[in-house]
């Protein structure tokens, strides 16, 4: 069976990385496992990552925004960023607002990677299904 | 042969959904059928599904944004929004502007579904080839 | 073998076509070559192409920013722009900002087939690996 | 800069017909409605049909189907319409105004014309 | 057709006080996206100019002391502080279907 992995918002998200809805709704996971924010890779190989981050707010004060895909593995000490967006001076002072951030590549993930998304201000992140999602396939 | 649709922008079409380009160009069509304004998947599995759209106009009014990829089915009574861009306070007033939403995802769809995308307001759209587009491919 | 490459931002770029890092970190390139800022196909068929490039500035005078991806074939006369993204009027006035441009479609390249990304102000590109990069894979 | 230029004044005769003219210019022409508004004298705005200059597709108010036409030429910019077997009734400032096509707004105005009728 | 009612007809306002226009509509206007409601300022002699369009937003070039709001059918125009040059008259208009309907129309005048 085709691995792959559709994920979409979970508004109910505290802390970093993001958390998904895996489950209800258009959600995909065939393949991949999901835990504790991340997908679990488990067949070494060539995948399509991607992810869109809606963010959003009343009052536009320009805080500058990141939209990280990251990778870890416990062979590694640290988090590999694999794709990134930032934002800054994105909206005029005080008015309501609202952008989106794109992320999408291949990369050649190994068995027992595990794929995060990060965001700098999680206050701002709206969760609606069709606006803020993560997933992936095996080519 | 493989399932896959590259669609681009269809300058004279008033209406909504957008129309587009299934002819000339660097358009693509196989093993999707075109319907006014429609990709009609005709074997079900899995899909990338993926849209850009430019946006641009004279003198910035912050006009609130938004590009969907929705998907109809006879079975089912209403659309589902399988993707979506909103932007708000995006450029300086007053001032030309333009911007980009791209959308793109892997969706698990049925055959008969018609999938079509969305503006929300056509007279800000540009059409050129390479600049607003439409398409998909099974995986 | 699977035809793929990613390739990242290399900052010694200094003309157009803009230049890319083949080698290393998370660069990928597998039955595809890299000659001189370009992906050489050199198998007929279908690609997913994509590419993303992160601009950004101590002090914004909304400089207008184009990004394309673009085709050239010497059996051609003229580049074909395959993908490209626009942005005008995007920041405040004398701010620090930053912005990226994505885009991915699919299209039917031919054996030889030469694809390149420019942009219209290289001094506004950050060539970091995980924000500006250009890839595509065969269907 | 978006500009609406209307034709002048027009005095005519009851059961006759008029022809008003709209030349817009500081925009692309054949992306967004033009939209034509009636104003009778110490009235509100009523709104008569839009055209699309894109493809010549049109709607109508069901109060002016039969009374008024849109046409456009989109060599030169001009939106027209024209007004048939007119009445002292007819008789208002008539307006074009640019329309964005989803939002249905009128963010660009003509002057007006005013219309006449009486014999 | 949608009937926009406008009420007051007529209000006069002191300088740097508020103006406060409202405009019922007899279904509501509203998406899960959008209230499409625009507010448009007449005076004698000159055409409509557009001033908050999607009932909320301020058109380019138009003072930050006009402001929109509402949702469904009911709607509010508030012009704060008044000026001398606010004297107009204000229509309320919908685009939620065909055909486009205004409201009647508030009179404006400075105390």
């Known amino acids: 069976l085709r691995k792959v992995a559709h994920l979409t918002g979970k508004s109910n998200s505290r802390s970093m990385p993001l958390e998904w809805e895996d489950t209800y709704g258009i959600v995909l996971l065939s393949g991949v496992k999901y835990k504790k924010g991340g997908l679990v890779i488990n067949e070494t190989g060539l995948y399509f990552v991607y992810s869109k981050v809606y963010f959003r707010g009343q009052s536009c004060n320009n805080l500058p925004l990141s939209h990280k895909v990251y990778m870890r593995n416990s062979k590694y000490p640290q988090d590999l960023v694999m794709m990134e967006g930032k934002m800054m001076s994105y909206c005029t002072t005080g008015q309501m607002w609202a952008r989106s951030s794109y992320l999408g590549a291949v990369f050649n993930l190994t068995s027992a990677d595990h794929l995060y998304v990060n965001v700098s201000e999680l206050s701002l992140v709206n969760f609606e299904e069709s606006q803020t999602f993560f997933g992936l396939y095996k080519l | 042969l493989r399932k896959v649709a590259h669609l681009t922008g269809k300058s004279n079409s008033r209406s909504m959904p957008l129309e587009w380009e299934d002819t000339y160009g660097i358009v693509l069509l196989s093993g999707v059928k075109y319907k006014k304004g429609g990709l009609v998947i005709n074997e079900t599995g899995l899909y990338f599904v993926y849209s850009k759209v430019y946006f641009r106009g004279q003198s910035c009014n912050n006009l609130p944004l938004s590009h969907k990829v929705y998907m109809r089915n006879s079975k089912y009574p209403q659309d589902l929004v399988m993707m979506e861009g909103k932007m708000m306070s995006y450029c300086t007033t007053g001032q030309m502007w333009a911007r980009s939403s791209y959308l793109g995802a892997v969706f698990n769809l049925t055959s008969a579904d018609h999938l079509y995308v969305n503006v929300s307001e056509l007279s800000l759209v540009n059409f050129e080839e390479s600049q607003t587009f439409f398409g998909l491919y099974k995986l | 073998l699977r035809k793929v490459a990613h390739l990242t931002g290399k900052s010694n770029s200094r003309s157009m076509p803009l230049e890319w890092e083949d080698t290393y970190g998370i660069v990928l390139l597998s039955g595809v070559k890299y000659k001189k800022g370009g992906l050489v196909i050199n198998e007929t068929g279908l690609y997913f192409v994509y590419s993303k490039v992160y601009f950004r500035g101590q002090s914004c005078n909304n400089l207008p920013l184009s990004h394309k991806v673009y085709m050239r074939n010497s059996k051609y006369p003229q580049d074909l722009v395959m993908m490209e993204g626009k942005m005008m009027s995007y920041c405040t006035t004398g701010q620090m900002w930053a912005r990226s441009s994505y885009l991915g479609a699919v299209f039917n390249l031919t054996s030889a087939d030469h694809l390149y990304v420019n942009v219209s102000e290289l001094s506004l590109v950050n060539f970091e690996e995980s924000q500006t990069f250009f890839g595509l894979y065969k269907l | 800069e978006v500009q609406l230029q209307q034709s002048g004044v027009e005095l005519v005769k009851p059961g006759a017909s008029v022809k008003l003219s709209c030349k817009a210019s500081g925009y692309t022409f054949t992306r967004f409605d033009i939209s034509w508004v009636r104003q009778r004298p110490e009235q509100g705005l009523e709104w008569i049909g839009w055209i699309f200059p894109g493809d010549g597709s049109s709607q109508y108010n069901e109060n002016f189907k039969g009374k008024a036409t849109l046409t456009t030429d989109k060599s030169s910019g001009t939106a027209y319409m024209q007004l048939n077997r007119l009445t002292s009734e007819d008789s208002a400032v008539y307006f074009c105004?640019?329309?964005?096509?989803?939002?249905?707004?009128?963010?660009?105005w003509g002057q007006g014309t005013t219309l006449t009728v009486s014999s | 057709d949608i009937v926009m009612t406008q009420s007051p007809a007529s209000l006069a306002v002191s300088l740097g006080q508020r103006a406060t226009i409202s405009c019922r509509a007899s279904?509501?206007?509203?998406?899960?996206?959008?209230?499409?409601i625009h507010w448009y300022q007449q005076k004698p002699g000159q055409p409509p100019k557009l001033l908050i369009f999607l009932a909320s937003h301020l058109e380019s070039g138009v003072p930050a002391r006009f402001s929109g709001s509402g949702s469904g059918t009911d709607f509010t125009l508030n012009i704060h502080p008044v000026e001398e040059e606010d004297a107009a008259t204000y229509y309320c208009q919908h685009s939620r279907e065909l055909p486009r309907t205004f409201g009647g129309g508030t009179k404006l005048e400075i105390k």
């Open positions: 105004a640019r329309s964005l096509i989803s939002t249905a707004m009128f963010d660009h």
């Open positions: 279904k509501s206007v509203s998406t899960s996206d959008f209230s499409y």
